[in-house]
């Protein structure tokens, strides 16, 4: 998976994995039945927080195991610790699945900093919070990893929910949703409302805390306000879009398209931080820097190094500013805009010294891989993945954080040329490189 | 040097109707887009229509469509913006701007596209 400040390893620097008005949802036909509309038993079915992911529960094996699954829109693999390990409170025991079969083969994935590798096999499959189905699909039981799994968080695996193509060993491993879509009437569709708190949790809180829902084969309308625009997936790989214009405070960064979208923008719900590729990052903290100058700052804030902290309840939200990514629409010539506030961008932390203040991480991090639209981004917005029509909704979350002056927006048409132009076009000697 | 000289603005009753010319003189390379702004009184500068100079290929604003009409003379290198069924709401200052170069990802009726702006004529519509 991706390069930099990637979850499942923390956000800290050293991280490493981790036109024509759109109509709205309810406007359309159904493409098949239950897509849209309630899903009351899926609703809330998703804990955690940004830092450290956000998980759902799953039972693998015979008799069914329950584990807490990390989910994970930026790889492919569906892989859970199978052996014993000093920070998971339990693990998938095969030897105690009547319903297991190995595949006798083996995977390794290493990451810029740490990895994981396992042994590949296939067992049952369900989600209590999700579909009524149950099925059958490929499953890595990791044996062995460094700097993977996270002290605290409470997940025990990871859902890899992108294309095949990016699934390890090879792009022959069926990806756990595509399983699911082929073995049972699930539509070919997810979407996602990761719910940011706003401000630190602790284990206990996380724990009692409701993180957010993924609706697997549907569409929730209780989970956003507004209307879902969409965004064509550009190419089924990891969830690739492409970014045409990037504004801070509504001013344009004025920098080629391109540039945005070197050497791709996925979205990314495995990633904490918004990443940008060098120049983009530079130019946009510059930016930040610029509307924010009423308070200075130390050079290792901007780094994502170092915290600052205000009494509590008296963090300056005014002297940030928006961020807003515009994305090519699904009409010709049209793009629409997602605004995002510093409530998504200042990530919430505990201050070991001092539980008085309120402190945050600038979670905007640079990245050598092109753009990635993490937690930051998502916590903004319900998200839908729309396998089927091969694009990606976005709509204002109904629990997003917000003040009384602004809200996170999704806004548009807006009139733009030539966006095709804006994507990148990676070597195809480059690909087979993909050291994550 | 590149000039953008804008001319027919004046005041007007609401339902009246008035033709702003722009004409284009210096240009040394062909324009890609020229497009009329206006900016009302504590207000930001808005695009109100836009024309490729090459292809005629128009867009407006959704407040000004059915109403307005952009056209273009290439022999005069003039670019005409016809404002009918005129409401006190268009009251504005009106700028023609041009872009000369073709890049990914423009946006016709944002004004930070645009790197040569005119004068600017004064429009007011009284009720």
């Known amino acids: 998976t991706q390069h930099g400040i990637r979850l499942p390893l923390r956000s800290g620097l050293g991280g490493a994995p981790l036109g024509l008005r759109l109509p709205r949802e309810t406007d359309e036909e159904p493409e098949e039945p239950g897509r849209r509309g309630s899903f009351v038993e899926m609703v809330d079915n998703l804990r955690g927080k940004s830092g450290q992911g956000y998980y759902v529960e799953m039972t693998v094996g015979s008799p069914p195991q329950t584990l807490n699954i990390l989910v994970d829109t930026g790889s492919s693999n569906f892989a859970v610790g199978a052996a014993p390990h000093p920070f998971l409170h339990r693990y998938y025991q095969r030897q105690l699945s009547s319903t297991y079969r190995d595949l006798r083969k083996g995977v390794y994935v290493p990451y810029t900093q740490g990895k994981w590798e396992g042994e590949l096999g296939t067992d049952l499959v369900s989600i209590p919070h999700g579909p009524n189905v149950t099925v059958r699909a490929n499953i890595a039981a990791i044996t062995e990893s460094d700097k993977f799994f996270i002290n605290g968080s409470n997940w025990e695996g990871i859902l890899g929910l992108a294309y095949a193509e990016i699934a390890r060993p090879d792009d022959s491993l069926e990806p756990f949703f595509d399983s699911l879509v082929k073995q049972t009437h699930v539509p070919n569709l997810f979407s996602l409302q990761l719910c940011g708190a706003g401000f630190p949790l602790n284990q206990s809180e996380v724990l009692a805390s409701v993180g957010g829902s993924m609706i697997i084969g549907g569409i929730d309308h209780s989970l956003y306000t507004g209307s879902l625009w969409y965004t064509p997936i550009r190419r089924e790989w990891y969830y690739e879009v492409i970014i045409v214009r990037v504004e801070i405070n509504g001013q344009d960064l004025k920098m080629d398209c391109k540039e945005y979208n070197y050497d791709k923008s996925i979205v990314d719900s495995g990633t904490t931080n918004l990443r940008l590729p060098k120049k983009v990052f530079e130019a946009a903290v510059k930016s930040i820097k610029a509307a924010s100058s009423t308070e200075k700052f130390p050079d290792g804030f901007w780094l994502g190094e170092q915290l600052v902290c205000w009494q509590a309840g008296t963090t300056p939200w005014n002297i940030f500013p928006v961020i807003s990514l515009y994305l090519m629409g699904e009409v010709t010539n049209q793009s629409f805009r997602i605004t995002i506030l510093p409530q998504q961008y200042l990530r919430p932390v505990e201050d070991v010294a001092t539980s008085q203040d309120d402190c945050y991480k600038f979670a905007i991090s640079q990245s050598s891989t092109g753009t990635v639209m993490g937690a930051v981004i998502m916590e903004g917005f319900y998200v839908v993945f729309d396998r089927a029509r091969k694009r990606i909704g976005f709509a204002v979350s109904a629990c997003h954080v917000h003040d009384e002056f602004r809200t996170a927006a999704v806004e548009g048409p807006f009139v733009t040329l030539d966006m095709e132009d804006c994507g990148y076009n990676i070597p195809q000697t480059d690909e087979s490189t993909l050291m994550t | 040097q590149v000039q953008l000289q804008e001319s027919g603005g004046g005041s007007v009753q609401a339902g009246g109707s008035l033709r702003l010319s722009c004409a284009a003189s210096?240009?040394?390379?062909?324009?890609?887009?020229i497009s009329w702004f206006r900016q009302a009184p504590g207000k930001e500068r808005e695009g109100v229509a836009a024309?490729?100079?090459?292809?005629?290929?128009?867009f407006y604003a959704d407040s000004v469509k059915g109403r307005f009409t952009i056209s273009q003379d290439n022999a005069k290198n003039t670019v005409y913006l016809q404002m009918n069924s005129l409401k006190p709401e268009d009251t504005a200052i009106y700028y023609c701007?041009?872009?000369?170069?073709?890049?990914?990802?423009?946006?016709?009726?944002?004004?930070?596209?645009?790197?040569?702006w005119g004068q600017g004529t004064q429009v007011t519509v009284s009720s």
């Open positions: 024309i490729n100079s090459g292809g005629g290929i128009t």
């Open positions: 210096g240009f040394t390379s062909s324009v890609y887009y």
């Open positions: 701007a041009a872009a000369l170069s073709r890049v990914p990802g423009f946006f016709p009726l944002f004004p930070s596209q645009y790197n040569y």
